[in-house]
């Protein structure tokens, strides 16, 4: 069964900067990745970035840099100052659309006890939805 993992990390150098990393553990080819904050895309969350293998990358402030890390994983840097910076308990979600598996989404947030710059290894997060 395909899985999606999500890792959220606060950067040690910039305390208002977050890095979100997501990956897809499946054999299909990825046609679209959507990153949202506040909850799953379309069910609480608002879109922060859309990554398409051919069309490129679409991102919304405060997303600073969305990029493909590998063919099946992406990263997104979020920056902000004051009100625009995400709070520690903000949920970030990644939705991978792949063929033939369909859409798979998982969410994560900053670990409650994490020090800046430290985070748990990217283990698969609970799968919230599979279309």
């Amino acid at each position: 069964t395909p899985e999606v993992w999500v890792q959220v990390r606060m950067e040690a150098t910039e305390l208002s900067s977050f890095t979100i990393r997501c990956g897809f553990l499946g054999s299909g080819s990825i046609s679209l990745v959507t990153v949202s904050w506040g909850g799953p895309n379309g069910a609480g969350g608002t879109t922060l970035a859309v990554l398409h293998p051919e069309r490129g990358i679409r991102q919304w402030a405060p997303a600073r840099q969305a990029r493909w890390e590998t063919q099946s994983s992406i990263s997104l840097i979020l920056e902000g100052s004051g009100a625009s910076s995400p709070c520690a308990n903000t949920t970030f979600c990644c939705k991978f659309a792949s063929f033939p598996e369909g859409s798979w989404e998982a969410c994560g947030s900053l670990p409650p006890s994490s020090d800046p710059g430290l985070s748990a290894p990217p283990t698969p997060a609970p799968i919230l939805r599979a279309d």
Partner: antibody
């Protein structure tokens, strides 16, 4: 019906701050982003930033970063845009506008606008 | 940032005329474009989203077309109430930018 009602006109001195409000009704407040756009006299439209009321998360145009703060009060379905260190070139009509949080493909409803005049 | 170039900057046309306004974008935005109409002293009104979709309540004489970097708003038969300034706007991520506007006057 969907409505965005903004606060009244403001006159401010250079260096001061202004806080404009936008009260939403007729839809689920936390389901949409609210953008702020301004228009200087006789000029075109300029995007300032947006806020997602559900989590209070916001994103601003680089030009306004550090000078603008957007907040949301979910209990009254009201969004606020505060602009500090005002200068004469900030004289403009400020609009709030609703945007679908998922599709993010248009601003479908707009407030009536708030004229902010910065003058010594 | 993505640049939007609208043309013409102004035009004068007669009732019943077919009017075309174009918007050229500095990079491919894959139809993530909206068109607005603004009348003096009023807020902009959404006409078209995703380049070709007519917003609710907008008369069918308005239509949008285009893809890639070139987009067009067409008014098939100009009506007296169509005067105003028209703006295009991209939604290919932030910062959102607008065209400089096309002022449409009725002859």
């Amino acid at each position: 019906q969907v409505q965005l009602v903004q606060s009244g006109a403001e006159v401010k001195k250079p260096g001061a701050s202004v806080k404009v409000s936008c009260k939403a009704s007729g839809y689920t407040f936390t389901d949409y982003n609210i953008n702020w756009v301004r228009q200087a006299p006789g000029q075109g439209l300029e995007w300032i930033g947006y806020i997602y009321p559900y989590i209070g998360g916001s994103g601003y145009a680089q030009k306004f970063q550090g000078r603008v703060t957007m907040t949301a009060d979910t209990s009254t379905s009201t969004v606020y845009m505060e602009l500090s260190s005002l200068r004469s070139e900030d004289t403009a009509v400020y609009y709030c506008a609703r945007e679908d949080k998922t599709a993010r493909n248009a601003m479908d409803y707009w407030g009536q606008g708030t004229l902010v005049t910065v003058s010594s | 940032d993505i640049q939007m170039t609208q043309s013409p900057s102004s035009l004068s046309a007669s009732v019943g005329d077919r009017v075309t306004i174009t918007c050229r974008v500095s990079e491919n935005i894959y139809s993530n474009l909206a068109w607005y109409q603004q009348k003096p002293g009023k807020a902009p009104k959404l006409l078209v989203y995703e380049a070709t979709n007519l917003a609710e309540g907008v008369p069918s004489r308005f239509s949008g077309s285009g893809s890639g970097t070139d987009y067009t708003l067409t008014i098939s038969s100009l009506q007296p109430e169509d005067f105003g300034t028209y703006y295009c706007q991209h939604f290919w991520g932030t910062p959102y930018t607008f065209g400089q506007g096309t002022k449409l006057e009725i002859k």
